[in-house]
Amino acid sequence: CKAMHVAQPAVVLASSRGIASFVCEYASPGKATEVRVTVLRQADSQVTEVCAATYMMGNELTFLDDSICTGTSSGNQVNLTIQGLRAMDTGLYICKVELMYPPPYYLGIGNGTQIYVIDPEPCPDSDF
């Protein structure tokens, strides 16, 4: 047994359309067949769950229909995309990975990705 390490980028800038993508990579100590990935947002010492998905290794990652997250998995790497972000959503987004099955259970928590969101300036009215 050894601890599970989770890596994610330190900083990501959301696009002008409010979309941010980052990779969450974990060093699996065991042969997990079922993995749960959760994105947590930490801002002003408050923690909220942004989204979560459980997937079987080799299968696609599926979030709930109303989730603001989408993602794909490849081996021990998860590509996460968060949409609909606004300036007020700027904060630290933490990737949490749990190896659910088979036992033993493993938990790994990344250091977080600081996502900066800048609301686009409204287009100036045209005089034409």
């Epitope: 601890a3 938990l107 790994g108």
Partner: antibody, heavy 118, light 108 residues
Framework: QVQLVESGGGVVQPGSSLRLSCAAS????????MHWVRQAPGKGLEWVAV????????HYADSVKGRFTTSRDNSKNTLHLQMNSLRAEDTAVYFC???????????WGQGTLVTVSS | EIVLTQSPGTLSLSPGERATLSCRAS???????LAWYQQKPGQAPRLLIY???SRATGIPDRFSGSGSGTDFTLTISRLEPEDFAVYYC?????????FGPGTKVDIK
């Protein structure tokens, strides 16, 4: 605020069964793993079992494996621990605890005492 | 399973003094997955520190945690009367989740 209330403890004979319950309120129950931890009189804390999120995955301490079963009803915000083939060494205060977003046990119930004695 | 050892078993100190509690793991523990709890007689445990060094909500800043790998420390900078209790470390990164045997901090 988060509240966890255990019930179902009591005095039973060795070999018998008991079902503990934990009523949860003040948070989104299905978003958290739920744990059982016990404490024998005058002793330290011992983790007993966990049931994750939708209830499909459970893990147990070796000392209770095959005898104890945990379950949850997310529609009723309730956690259960079915204890069979009870032994004297199962005598303890049983706590339910919420697994926080970061995995630590961030909220605990007040505990319910189970005494196994002939 | 990961075995946690705490030392000393009992720490006798006076209010205002500094308390240093140690927790050692039998194998490396992710610092993200190490917690400290306080328990007073007849009460449930209370989370103090998670992730080795992050204070739980409402915990005074006289409590601090540090360490990595196999060695972790809980420090209480100036003991208040309400701090005399039993303190447990716990790892929650790998099942079975395990607690240390506890350190009792009592009044000298």
């Amino acid at each position: 605020q988060v509240q966890l209330v255990e019930s179902g403890g009591g005095v039973v004979q060795p070999g018998s069964s008991l079902r503990l319950s934990c009523a949860a309120s003040g948070f989104t129950f299905s978003s958290h793993g739920m744990h059982w931890v016990r404490q024998a009189p005058g002793k330290g804390l011992e983790w007993v079992a966990v049931i994750w999120y939708d209830g499909s995955n459970k893990h147990y301490a070796d000392s209770v494996k095959g005898r104890f079963t945990t379950s949850r009803d997310n529609s009723k915000n309730t956690l259960h621990l079915q204890m069979n083939s009870l032994r004297a060494e199962d005598t303890a205060v049983y706590f339910c605890a919420r697994g926080g977003y970061f995995g630590c046990f961030d909220s605990w119930g007040q505990g319910t005492l189970v005494t196994v004695s002939s | 399973e990961i075995v946690l050892t705490q030392s000393p078993g009992t720490l006798s100190l006076s209010p205002g003094e500094r308390a240093t509690l140690s927790c050692r793991a039998s194998q490396s523990v992710s610092s993200s997955c190490l917690a400290w709890y306080q328990q007073k007689p007849g009460q449930a445990p209370r989370l103090l520190i998670y992730g080795a060094s992050s204070r739980a909500t409402g915990i005074p800043d006289r409590f601090s945690g540090s360490g990595s790998g196999t060695d972790f420390t809980l420090t209480i900078s100036r003991l208040e009367p309400e701090d005399f209790a039993v303190y447990y470390c716990q790892q929650y990164g790998i099942s079975p989740f395990t607690f240390g045997p506890g350190t009792k901090v009592d009044i000298k």
